[in-house]
């Protein structure tokens, strides 16, 4: 089930997922001057069975200069500005992505993809927060957020993180040592 809202915004912090739950969708966005190939996929979709998960469909971009009637997927300047802060941060490759059952790893980049990735998360997804460069993390609890569903409405839990303006950055979990995150929670309705 798709999360119909976004992970919370924490001042001076960014978030990312270590792995993506089955059902997660990634928009096939192209950088400026390029567009999705005609009849190309709109999304990549994390799918799988009990033993293996992988991304279905491939995103492919082609130069907008070539004549084609397909509508451009590349955002126009105004739209580009809006999209900068949407859904997920830039396509970074986490150092460690534990092989959780029912999860996909970060998809590899495709040629001429947009600078920002737009993910559509599903219920049960967990994202991790870290302070941006120049800010230090003050933890009151886990620096993570989970998408939960209650009464048919989705919401993200509030990460217990404050970023204070002192040099020294914290790391995402798993960037020090490999570990499985407690992300594979059942995708069930939270009791009302």
């Amino acid at each position: 089930e798709l999360c119909d809202d976004d992970p919370p915004e924490i001042p001076h912090a960014t978030f990312k997922a270590m792995a993506y739950k089955e059902g997660t969708m990634l928009n096939c966005e192209c950088k400026r001057g390029f567009r999705r190939i005609k009849s190309g996929s709109l999304y990549m979709l994390c799918t799988g069975n009990s033993s293996h998960s992988s991304w279905d469909n491939q995103c492919q971009c082609t130069s907008s200069a070539t004549r084609n009637t397909t509508k451009q997927v590349t955002p126009q300047p105004e739209e580009q500005k809006e999209r900068k802060t949407t859904e997920m941060q830039s396509p970074m490759q986490p150092v460690d992505q534990a092989s959780l059952p029912g999860h996909c790893r970060e998809p590899p980049p495709w040629e001429n993809e947009a600078t920002e990735r737009i993910y559509h998360f599903v219920v049960g997804q967990m994202v991790y927060y870290q302070c941006v460069q120049g800010y230090r993390a003050l933890h009151r609890g886990p620096a993570e957020s989970v998408c939960k569903m209650t009464h048919g409405k989705t919401r993200w839990t509030q990460p217990q993180l404050i970023c204070t303006g002192e040099m020294e950055t914290s790391q995402f979990p798993g960037e020090e040592k490999p570990q499985a995150s407690p992300e594979g929670r059942p995708e069930s309705e939270t009791s009302c």
Partner: antibody, heavy 116, light 106 residues
Framework: QVQLVQSGAEVKKPGSSVKVSCKAS????????MHWVRQAPGQGLEWIGY????????EYNQKFKDKATITADKSTNTAYMELSSLRSEDTAVYYC?????????WGQGTLVTVSS | DIQMTQSPSTLSASVGDRVTITCSAS?????MHWYQQKPGKAPKLLIY???NLASGVPARFSGSGSGTEFTLTISSLQPDDFATYYC?????????FGQGTKVEVK
Amino acid sequence: QVQLVQSGAEVKKPGSSVKVSCKASGYTFTSYRMHWVRQAPGQGLEWIGYIKPSRGYTEYNQKFKDKATITADKSTNTAYMELSSLRSEDTAVYYCARGGGVFDYWGQGTLVTVSS
Amino acid sequence: DIQMTQSPSTLSASVGDRVTITCSASSSISYMHWYQQKPGKAPKLLIYTTSNLASGVPARFSGSGSGTEFTLTISSLQPDDFATYYCHQRSTYPLTFGQGTKVEVK
């Protein structure tokens, strides 16, 4: 209480455009996505797309990507959907519906009739 | 896109009847949601996440199913229940609805 109030019925000529509004009250407008759904006469429901009022980000059903443009005005708690290059097939009732999961609140619907 | 196929399209029934509407998804989905619509009115949320009744919905309505096959049941049809019912998936974009099942007076 939560309310979504849509603009009145419109009659338009083929080739023209129309902008339907949906004014939200009773909740924090920027906390929920606003979705739009179409229902042609005697037909079922079709999802058009949504907007995140907080950021202006939109996601569309590919079928309506060239037809609909969804916007929002945070200052007036109003979402808009503009339909361009109208054709007779665009005659339908258009609904806004509050997101954040299932559509628990709907506007009353706006009938757009395209006729020469 | 995930196609949603409801059956039957029209159902003729009498007050007191037990009514069952099925909805089949072209791919496996997490949950099914159901809406009720009366002529000239906006749809109304009836059942969410397959089996949970929306606020104010009578207990004669129930939902079940998993994967690709889902069911809406009205245990004893009441006069207020004559309407059109739509199943809905929001497991993947584009969000899709079934074509509707009209429950009419026999």
